[in-house]
Amino acid sequence: IVLRPSRVHNSEENTMRALTLKDILNGTFSYKTFFPNWISGQEYLHQSADNNIVLYNIETGQSYTILSNRTMKSVNASNYGLSPDRQFVYLESDYSKLWRYSYTATYYIYDLSNGEFVRGNELPRPIQYLCWSPVGSKLAYVYQNNIYLKQRPGDPPFQITFNGRENKIFNGIPDWVYEEEMLATKYALWWSPNGKFLAYAEFNDTDIPVIAYSYYGDEQYPRTINIPYPKAGAKNPVVRIFIIDTTYPAYVGPQEVPVPAMIASSDYYFSWLTWVTDERVCLQWLKRVQNVSVLSICDFREDWQTWDCPKTQEHIEESRTGWAGGFFVSTPVFSYDAISYYKIFSDKDGYKHIHYIKDTVENAIQITSGKWEAINIFRVTQDSLFYSSNEFEEYPGRRNIYRISIGSYPPSKKCVTCHLRKERCQYYTASFSDYAKYYALVCYGPGIPISTLHDGRTDQEIKILEENKELENALKNIQLPKEEIKKLEVDEITLWYKMILPPQFDRSKKYPLLIQVYGGPCSQSVRSVFAVNWISYLASKEGMVIALVDGRGTAFQGDKLLYAVYRKLGVYEVEDQITAVRKFIEMGFIDEKRIAIWGWSYGGYVSSLALASGTGLFKCGIAVAPVSSWEYYASVYTERFMGLPTKDDNLEHYKNSTVMARAEYFRNVDYLLIHGTADDNVHFQNSAQIAKALVNAQVDFQAMWYSDQNHGLSGLSTNHLYTHMTHFLKQCFSLSD
């Protein structure tokens, strides 16, 4: 059980207040984290509260401002990047968001040696992506879908690609589907370790069907937004990888990296690129049917100026029970010999663990093992491997950082974080300096988050970087809900849940229950993290019990649970939410006439199907930006879990798993359907089709659209959304306003 430490004495209760919706919407109780911007083994940059860019040297204890807030303000900079030779800084302004990761901006180069902005050969605007080389001060940038190179900031740009075209050919940046579902970055170019070569992807979207939607704006006529967006079964982008010598880019030009024959024989994806040395690169490819992944190690052949990817350096990863990898196929972390690597994949028992691959995957040496999962490899040094896992005390929703000594035999394992601040901190991530000389730990909870700096050799804490004192003080007179994380054992399935209980919770009383669900494949909702959010308010002020349940399809508990939903989305995720609700009712403190469910995105899909399950368990529910049919969602994501919507593959389940097919079943529930009209991700089409089916079935429901809002429903829409949902739930639960 994880209980928030109680600071409440009865005599103080009258000074305590419940959370208000206003607190949540104003972000009154938001927390800060501190991630050092490492620039060497012992130095990092950080933007101070007054917006100066400060360089800290851990070993000397000295700090100095390398860039003043005055310089930042002179170009309205919101971000910066120091060149590795420390001669220049790029300043980023005019940020303009595109999709989840992508944005355009204006860039200015500031010369630290003379304290002036670089004049002459200024960068064009707006730029889609810009980065320094890892050594020196070369610049690569993407402008109008083409890649440019500068040897020095004041030099003229060298144009690397010429075929870039809006919505057609993307060089060095991903198209929509690669950005959202494969790379999870705004860039698709990678410098080699010393900046000798630049690798980049070219995405050809020429044949991809386009999603078009209206953007209403303020003009007399709405604009039409067009995005090449492959839905399940549609034509996909064609990807090619090129590498160019950045010292002499003109002599040979970009050289294409060959695709492994077993991948190239049918539709495929490129999934990631990892440089090993300046003359060795590792590419990962994936078949369109995403259960086969190939890792290909390629070497530069100087005599032919080409990249050679011998079959002997191809490593195949295949899943027989589901798809390859977790959410994504894991990426390798190479060791110092520049050929062997560490990688997370399923062991023979179906748990994702770290393996060491020296020659073939078949001969891989398993580094971690157990009925838990290794989640991320942070760093490999000459003698240590740092990783995170959920091993400690068998709580899947925790994250601790471990160190394995790889220099000694047998390798010894040490949990770096398990006992540091055990009550406060059970969910960590880490950020390492060069050679792991130092590292920062960022603890996300369950207590108030705290960021600390540590010695990479001894693991000793050096200093606290951020402890959120102001937040701690602000929460002193707030009646926070209690939280507990427990598990249900049902038919050989373990269902972990988090329950958020009103501050004066009394097991002998009856409370309305709200289920918050996401439930997407390889997701995890039950995590030991701190949050003061909308559901905290609903428990604190409105006296609701809120529960989050990780059912089949969720992550970090082994492949049996994860791959249970393979090829049949929308079945077990819903069943497990329903099963959990029945168990909660059995606990005796739930008012079974007042149970609701809500979710966003995949959670909107699950909440809709749960409401339409015909169980009679739910009085009402909310779906925000739900998927309604897998035929409407992106190919890369959907086909990973569902296969293709073709007769000879999985069309039948595509049809059976729609929300529309269950329209009749909404008759006996109160349903609130919400969607942004400019949702580039889960298209408004999804909710439009639900609404049409409900109207055709003559089923009453409530709906709210948010004009020109995307999948995130941000800004003022957020306030309106949560206010609207609060009213809906209070009405459903007969709570007074």
């Epitope: 030099d155 003229p156 144009q159 010429f162 000798k196 010598d245 010292t247 003109a250 002599y251």
Partner: antibody, heavy 120, light 103 residues
Framework: QVQLLESGGGVVQPGRSLRLSCAAS????????MHWVRQAPGKGLEWVAV????????YYADSVKGRFTISRDNSKNTLYLQMNSLRADDTAVYYC?????????????WGQGTLVTVSA | NIQLTQSPSSLSASVGDRVTITCRAS??????LNWYQQKPGKAPKLLIS???SLQGGVPSRFSGSGSGTDFTLAISSLQPEDSATYYC?????FGQGTKLEIK
């Protein structure tokens, strides 16, 4: 001041080999990319080969690829061009040239040239 | 491969004249274009780099302009010592040369 001095030219029969040298002084040799450029009698300039400051990058004109090899010895401040399988159309004055700086592809300093004559 | 085409291949002008030589690239090369002067029996000499940057010691009557595919070398007031062959160059490619004679 910067000085580049080519040597090793002469008359050679077709199919034979020759090695040109270029001795550099007056600048930090190991910091600059170096090129060979040739000029056939009465003709224009033709770029032959380049080598980066540390020797890790080498490129050749198509006309000499597989026959000529560019190299450098930074400890001796010397650039080399090994020419094998020489042909009559390789007859030219060979210049070594230093980049103004890496990345702009301009040749700021040139040697005086050495004549290579390929003749039976 | 990028081709550079110079025009004219030769020209004759009088002292004091303004002279222009053009260089056209087969595809866009930003402003990575250099101009050289070569006198008989001598090594080439860099006049202008990056399309318009005059090298130190080069008389100010020489100027360069252009970007993309079309570039120009101009001599504002021709002097007797400007008689030479002029080459444009982009990395490993030279133009065929323009021979300038003084009338």
């Amino acid at each position: 001041q910067v000085q580049l001095l080519e040597s090793g030219g002469g008359v050679v029969q077709p199919g034979r080999s020759l090695r040109l040298s270029c001795a550099a002084s007056g600048f930090t040799f190991s910091s600059y990319g170096m090129h060979w450029v040739r000029q056939a009698p009465g003709k224009g300039l033709e770029w032959v080969a380049v080598i980066s400051y540390d020797g890790s990058n080498k490129y050749y004109a198509d006309s000499v690829k597989g026959r000529f090899t560019i190299s450098r010895d930074n400890s001796k401040n010397t650039l080399y061009l090994q020419m094998n399988s020489l042909r009559a159309d390789d007859t030219a004055v060979y210049y070594c040239a230093r980049e103004s700086y890496t990345g702009l592809g301009s040749f700021l300093h040139w040697g005086q040239g050495t004549l290579v004559t390929v003749s039976a | 491969n990028i081709q550079l085409t110079q025009s004219p291949s030769s020209l004759s002008a009088s002292v004091g004249d303004r002279v222009t030589i053009t260089c056209r690239a087969s595809q866009t090369i930003s402003n990575y274009l250099n101009w050289y002067q070569q006198k008989p029996g001598k090594a080439p000499k860099l006049l202008i780099s990056a399309a318009s940057s005059l090298q130190g010691g080069v008389p100010s009557r020489f100027s360069g302009s252009g970007s993309g595919t079309d570039f120009t070398l101009a001599i504002s007031s021709l002097q007797p010592e400007d008689s030479a062959t002029y080459y444009c160059q982009y990395w490993g490619t030279f133009g065929q040369g323009t021979k300038l004679e003084i009338k």
